[in-house]
């Protein structure tokens, strides 16, 4: 006869491990008992369980409640056992020693490999600001056994670097993603992808990039100066900018206080019916936590009568 087992049994942390040991005997041969022991190098054999044809299953106190025989029906030549709820400390070498009649004793060894799936964590780097050089966007760490693979999935252009730390029964892998921040990256996803044989599918953690910036400010509303004449209603100036975080707007007049009746509504400055008093230099001040910008325009409110008079003069002068 001969023993049938596996060289390696692989199980995920917390699952049950079946340790196979089957005696393929000639007809008439019987298995008296099967002794299972842990036999890691440098240490004596530690009893796991004894399956006896008459006495039944004896489980070592160290494994009480964790070792069982596979459910019926059972073949009397099958000395396999189930190790419940495998933990990392169970990883190692195991031996089954089979006592048969009349052929004698046989033994076989197997290695139990306990996969410890990683629980990845993603840590964003320092605040990203436009104008910075190469900057850490995020780091992703995953610890498991064996060492997990950590990669990045993103449309953003950047560079990655990885390092690994080996522990007694596992390895931690950290990958960093560096980039040169630009406003076009704002809102873009940066996904850490962790692969491991103990995972049914890759684990993904997504971080949304936030790049602080503030665009140049400009003022709209003076495109047609002829519209800015005395008596005109609904005249307004709008300050244009964009930023992250979204900026706030403030309006001032360079050559004095804002005239009465002028309404400030965020990025918009609304005028009452225009008078010459509204002529002046207006400043839009745009700011966020990252920066501030100014844009100024000169408003010249025209008097139509003056203009037409001047026009006549010009005509007569010609």
């Amino acid at each position: 006869g001969e023993l049938e087992t596996s060289d390696v049994v692989t199980v995920v942390l917390g699952q049950d491990a079946k340790l196979p040991c089957f005696y393929r005997g000639d007809s008439g041969e019987q298995v008296g008992q099967v002794a299972w022991a842990r036999v890691d190098a440098g240490e004596g054999a530690q009893e796991l369980a004894l399956l006896h044809s008459k006495y039944g299953l004896h489980v070592s106190p160290a494994y009480e409640g964790r070792v069982e025989q596979p459910p019926p029906p059972r073949n009397p030549l099958d000395g396999s056992v189930l190790l419940r709820n495998a933990v990392q400390a169970d990883e190692g070498e195991y031996e089954c020693r089979v006592s048969t009649f009349p052929a004698g004793s046989f033994q076989a060894r197997l290695r139990l490999r306990v996969l410890v799936p990683p629980l990845p964590s993603l840590n964003p780097g320092p605040a990203l600001e436009e104008g910075q050089g190469l900057t850490l966007a995020a780091s992703c760490t995953a610890e498991g056994s064996p060492a997990p693979s950590v990669t990045w999935d993103t449309e953003v252009k950047g560079t990655t670097s990885s390092r690994s730390f080996k522990h007694s029964r596992s390895a931690a892998v950290t990958s960093e993603f560096h980039l040169v921040p630009s406003r076009s990256m704002n809102g873009q996803p940066l996904t850490c992808v962790v692969s491991h044989p103990g995972l049914l599918q890759d684990q993904r953690i997504t971080h949304i990039l936030h790049v602080s910036f503030l665009a140049e400010a400009s003022v709209r509303g003076l495109e047609d100066q002829n519209l800015w004449h005395i008596g005109r209603e609904g005249a307004m100036l709008k300050c244009l900018s964009e930023g992250q975080p979204p900026p706030s707007y403030n309006w001032t007049r360079l050559d004095g206080p804002l005239p009465s009746g002028v309404r400030v509504d965020g990025d918009t400055l609304g005028f009452p019916p225009l008078t010459t008093e509204h002529s002046g230099i207006y400043v839009c001040h745009v700011s966020n936590e990252f920066s501030s910008r100014d844009s100024q325009v000169t408003v010249d409110v025209l008097d139509p009568q003056e203009d037409s008079g001047k026009q006549v003069d010009l005509v007569s002068a010609s």
Epitope: Q33, A45, L50, K54, Y55, G56, H58, R97
Partner: antibody, heavy 123, light 107 residues
């Protein structure tokens, strides 16, 4: 024929010592685990100690730990129990018995017993 | 330690009676259970090992059953020489422990 014959019992004062012997014959003595089991007058059976075939890992009942020592001499086919600091509650018939080692520290039932030797601890 | 609880502690029966003695372990012991017979002034004698296996030379009127925690010794037809004290013993763990015994007396 398997035979186990105990000797060495007798009357001893509290605090005294006694050494019991068990002579074995009719089987491969060195291939079996050997135990001492005692029975106080009118009481039930109480396991005392066991020694493995290879003379390693002697085991003791809590009630005798530190006072009794089990040993064997496979060349003489003899099992011993050295009893020190004896107490009145150690008064009993002491039996030796054999059991087959299955594996590790797991044994069969004791299939053969000696006739016993009486130890009386009294002042 | 594993406690072995035997019942009854004594019983009276007549020759030819069917006698049943039970033994309960405080935790599972698979079939690591033996039954012994002891007569006054004599050493215990192994009757049943592995809960249900008859020791060589023991009459077939003795039988054992059970596994785990609950075990039974049955004497199918009591004979005069069967009047004795019967003990169960577990040897699943160290220390091995005995039941308190069941004395079978003549009615």
């Amino acid at each position: 024929e398997v035979q186990l014959v105990e000797s060495g019992g007798g009357l001893v004062q509290p605090g005294g010592s006694l050494r019991l012997s068990c002579a074995a014959s009719g089987f491969n003595f060195g291939g079996y685990g050997m135990s001492w089991v005692r029975q106080a007058p009118g009481k039930g059976l109480e396991w005392v100690s066991r020694i493995s075939p290879g003379d390693s890992t002697p085991r003791y009942a809590d009630s005798v730990k530190g006072r009794f020592t089990i040993s064997r001499d496979n060349s003489k086919n003899t099992l011993y129990l050295q009893m020190n600091s004896l107490r009145a509650e150690d008064t009993a018939v002491y039996y030796c018995a054999r059991a087959e080692l299955l594996a590790f520290d797991v044994y069969t039932a004791s299939d053969y017993w000696g006739q016993g030797t009486l130890v009386t601890v009294s002042s | 330690d594993i406690q072995m609880t035997q019942s009854p502690s004594s019983l009276s029966a007549s020759v030819g009676d069917r006698v049943t003695i039970t033994c309960r372990a405080s935790q599972g012991i698979s079939s690591y259970l033996a039954w012994y017979q002891q007569k006054p002034g004599k050493a215990p004698k192994l009757l049943i090992y592995a809960a249900s296996s008859l020791q060589s030379g023991v009459p077939s009127r003795f039988s054992g059953s059970g596994s785990g925690t609950d075990f039974t010794l049955t004497i199918s037809s009591l004979q005069p020489e069967d009047f004795a004290t019967y003990y169960c013993q577990q040897h699943y763990t160290t220390p091995p422990t005995f039941g308190q015994g069941t004395k079978v007396e003549i009615k």
